[in-house]
Structures are given as C-alpha cells and as structure tokens.
C-alpha cells in the first residue's frame, strides 16, 4: 500500500508521458490523477515503466474503479494486464472481441495464464456461446484452446462455429470432447459431399457412431490408420470385414501392424476367421470356422 503524500510543486502530471518514468513510486501515487490515467491508458504501453511503477498505476485504477474497470480502460491495459489477478478480471464485463484480442496479444507466445483463462471465461459467458469469430480468435492464439474446455462447456459451441476449427486444434482433445464436437461438425458440414466432406470431418471422427462409419465405407474415403485407431471401439465393433475394407481402402494393409491394439484387436475378436482371411493379411484371433454365432437380439425377440 503506497502512503498518501502530497505531490511536490511542479510535478503534477498533465498527461501520461515519458517524464513519468523518472518519478518515484510515491510521486506517481501523489502526482498522477487516476481519471487522467484512465483516459490515457493507451499511452502507458509506449512508456518503459518498471514493474513497481506499474503496480502503482494499477493501484490508482483499482481505487477509481473498485467495482471493476470499464471496457474503455480494459481495451488499453496493454502490459498492465499482466499485473491483474483472476479476482480483478472477474469484476470485468468484456463484450468486445477487439478488447479480447488486444489482451491476448499481450500474453502472446506464453502458456495460457490463469488471468487469460479467467478473461476468456468472462468473455464467453458474457456472449452466451462460443461463436465462430471468438473461436477463430482463441484458436489462433491458443491452438489447444478447444480441448481445454470441458464437455459441458463445449455444449454451448454452436455448430456454425465448427467451421473455424482446424485439425491441429483437436490434437489434444480426448474422446469425451470429441463425443460433443462430432455431432456439431456433422451438422455444420452436412451439406458438403464426397472427399471435401471427409477432409473436414476426419479430425472429429473419434466421436462418430457405427452408422456414420458404415455410411463412410460406401464413399471410397480411404481412411488412414491413424484416424481409424482413434475411432470409438464400440463404434468399430459392429462393422463387417467388408465395411472395414471399404472404409480403409488401400490402408487396410495397416491393420496387420495394429492387430494387438484397440480398436483393431477387439474388432478382430468379433469377426469370423474365414472373413478375416479374405483380407489376405494373416490376421488371427477371429471366431473359428464352424462356430455358431448367436444373434442375441433375435433370441430376445423370440423369448
């Protein structure tokens, strides 16, 4: 806490300029009017203040705006943003995407700090949903942003925003997140067809149901093994050998290298061995020839 001391004669700041870097902390406190600082925040960034001096400037703004800074000030905080605590930021009402961009720029190149996470949370909650422009902005600064959200938070992403998502934005998403994002992508890209559609949907396929995989198998998509290995096991299991062969196209040969890993291992166990043999890959572990496979759903219907 800086002590209240009178401003020395002739030192009263009339504007925010470089002369202030020579002021001691107590002089800044005494001689810089908080209202002046608020109206000239855009100049602060251009002046090489020390961290201690920035602390004083922050303190003056806190006194002027105890309920939280107005957006006109927030937009021009610049490096002073790094001095803010998550508690400070929770008092803000940030509605402009330009303000968000300006503050993210300050933190550019660094990991997402608790301050940035709080800022984004406040901004998204204020908007009510993660619209396309916001998602575009956030993934540009933090490619892993989408995958940092909980499935609950992802629920509020409108399908139209999915157009802003790039494959690398999904690299760190887990299956629970893809479960939420996939149907949104399906809705977003539903009017595309063929190879164009597959390029767009491919990174989301970890959330696809069996029915969509069956449909893709009819479209000559030639899914690569890396994508196939990320599919939900329960979605892959009901696929027939013929469907998997059509789905993978020339990549079907890669099944041999993955035969001990899920979902390939579990899928092999569900197939008749003679069906697997038609692939000519030497896949082993299928249901032996001559064994009867009971359709339990039929048994249930008859009982």
């Amino acid at each position: 806490e800086v002590e209240k001391t009178a401003c020395p004669s002739g030192k009263k700041a009339r504007e925010i300029d470089e002369s202030l870097i020579f002021y001691k902390k107590w002089e800044l406190e005494a001689c810089v009017d908080a209202a002046l600082l608020a109206t000239q925040m855009d100049r602060v960034n251009a002046i090489p203040f020390t961290y201690e001096q920035l602390d004083v400037l922050k303190h003056k703004l806190d006194e002027l705006y105890p309920q939280g800074y107005p957006e006109s000030v927030i937009q021009h905080l610049g490096y002073l943003f790094l001095k803010m605590s998550p508690e400070d930021i929770r008092k803000w009402n940030v509605t402009s995407l330009e303000t968000l961009k300006a503050l993210l720029e300050v933190n550019k190149g660094h990991e997402m700090s608790p301050q940035v996470a709080t800022l984004i949370d406040r901004f998204v909650k204020g908007r009510g949903q993660l619209d396309k422009d916001t998602l575009d902005t956030l993934t540009a600064f933090y490619p892993g942003y989408l995958c940092s959200l909980s499935p609950e938070e992802l629920s509020s992403v409108p399908p139209s925003s999915i157009w802003a998502v790039r494959p690398q934005d999904l690299d760190t998403c887990d299956p629970r997140q893809l479960d939420v994002l996939y149907p949104k992508a399906r809705l977003a890209f539903q009017n595309m067809n063929g190879s164009e559609y597959f390029v767009k949907i491919q990174s989301f396929l970890g959330g696809a149901p069996t029915e969509d995989l069956k449909a893709l198998s009819q479209q000559n998509v030639s899914m690569d093994l890396a994508t196939f290995m990320k599919l939900r096991t329960d979605a892959v299991l009901p696929l027939t050998v013929a469907e998997v062969q059509k789905l993978l196209g020339p990549h079907v040969e890669g099944l041999k290298a993955e035969e001990r890993h899920r979902p390939v291992r579990d899928w092999i166990l569900r197939q008749r061995q003679d069906d697997l043999d038609t692939l000519g890959l030497g896949l082993q572990g299928g249901i032996p020839n001559g064994y009867l496979v009971l359709d339990l759903s039929m048994q249930e219907a008859l009982s």
Epitope: S155, Q190, A215
Partner: antibody, heavy 120, light 107 residues
Framework: EVKLVESGGGLVQPGGSLSLSCAAS????????MSWVRQPPGKALEWLGF??????????EYSASVKGRFTISRDNSQSILYLQMNALRAEDSATYYC???????????WGQGTSVTVSS | NIVMTQSPKSMSMSVGERVTLSCKAS??????VSWYQQKPEQSPKLLIH???NRYTGVPDRFTGSGSATDFTLTISSVQAEDLADYYC?????????FGSGTKLEIK
C-alpha cells in the same frame, strides 16, 4: 413443406397381417433414412426400425421386438414408406408413426400416426 | 439394448419457473441424444438433437446439455403451451431407444 401421412391402420386379429403406408412430400425422399416408431396407448415411444437412403443402399435395421415379423420397405418413385406387419400380437396394438431421420438420426418430422388394434 | 431412464416421471410447475428434466443412458451414447415434445393428442416434435443443439424453430428457452450418460433438458422460463410429455431418445446405436417420458403439468 415436409409432410408425412400414414394410412392402413385398423383392427386385426392376433396372428394376422397388416400393411401400413406413409406418403412423403416436400423433400427429396431418396436422400433420407426413414423410420417407424410406435406408441401403445398411454405409453412411451418405441423405435421399430429404419431403412437407409439411396447412398447407403436402402438397407434396413430392426428392433429385436419386431425383427423377423415386420418388414420396412420403400417405393422411391412414389415417395412411399411401408411397414409390413405379420404374426401380429396383442402387444403390437399402438399408434404407428412414420418419421424422417436427419443427419444425427434424430426424428425431425413425424406423421400424424395411424392406429393399429390387435384383438380377437 | 441401451436403456434411457428419465426423471422425474411427472412434474407440476408455474408459468415463468425454470424446469430441469433428466435423462440417463445405461451406456455411453456420446452426444447422440435427442429430446422430443409431445403435446396432448399430437405427434412428437423434435426439440434438441446431438444433446445440445436446438432444432430449427425451437424457442431458445429450451436448452439441452450433457454427454456420455447424463443428459438434461432445461426450460428457462416455462410457458402454458409447454404442457406436454417430454421424451429423450438415443440414436448412437441400434436399436434406437427412448426414455419412458416426463409429463410436465402447468399449475
């Protein structure tokens, strides 16, 4: 405007057969999966099965309760969906709805329903 | 078969109140859950698909959320015309299945 209109319901004896029809209009019929759902009086909805679209070869899937007794088919030239019901039982009594499936396999359009009563 | 369990069986609310309906799946169904509204003597209507996506033309007081096994339909401010049965259904794997419904009555 999308419209689905069922017909063919009525009273039938146990063990008997009945064929329901659903006339579709207002959309490209061959692009969509079509489904049948039933609802016994005062009870919940039950999915019976669907028939896939042209791109997926018009193949079918059924629920265990009707597999082997009911058959779903479609006349794409006339945009009509059918449900052929054989070996009917008292528990098949219900209102039968024809539905269109959208991209997430939710039922986005429903017909008005047709009532089937199986009783001696 | 995947069992969809809805709760409560019925509820009575006043106009303007917030309503929360629950639906639990016996297995992970991703986000392949839809919510339907069936008014007395009418066919069901689709409200929400993909767990959280409002269907075209549905008022924004209806919101869906959840994934995997736990799903919720929220009506932020219930209106007299919302008197109906509400069903959840899964379309992740066949046989597709519905819950037994929640009857919403208006006081």
């Amino acid at each position: 405007e999308v419209k689905l209109v069922e017909s063919g319901g009525g009273l039938v004896q146990p063990g008997g057969s009945l064929s329901l029809s659903c006339a579709a209009s207002g959309f490209t019929f061959t692009d969509y999966y079509m489904s049948w759902v039933r609802q016994p009086p005062g009870k919940a909805l039950e999915w019976l099965g669907f028939i896939r679209n042209k791109a997926n070869g018009y193949t079918t899937e059924y629920s265990a309760s009707v597999k082997g007794r009911f058959t779903i088919s479609r006349d794409n030239s006339q945009s009509i969906l059918y449900l052929q019901m054989n070996a009917l039982r008292a528990e098949d009594s219900a209102t039968y709805y024809c539905t269109r499936l959208e991209v997430l396999y939710a039922m986005d359009y429903w017909g008005q329903g047709t009532s089937v009563t199986v009783s001696s | 078969n995947i069992v969809m369990t809805q709760s409560p069986k019925s509820m009575s609310m006043s106009v303007g109140e917030r309503v929360t309906l629950s639906c639990k799946a016996s297995e992970n169904v991703g986000s392949y859950v839809s919510w339907y509204q069936q008014k007395p003597e009418q066919s069901p209507k689709l409200l929400i698909h993909g767990a959280s996506n409002r269907y075209t033309g549905v008022p924004d007081r209806f919101t869906g959320s959840g994934s995997a096994t736990d799903f919720t339909l929220t009506i932020s401010s219930v209106q007299a015309e919302d008197l109906a049965d509400y069903y959840c259904g899964q379309s992740y794997s066949y046989p597709y299945t519905f819950g037994s419904g929640t009857k919403l009555e208006i006081k």
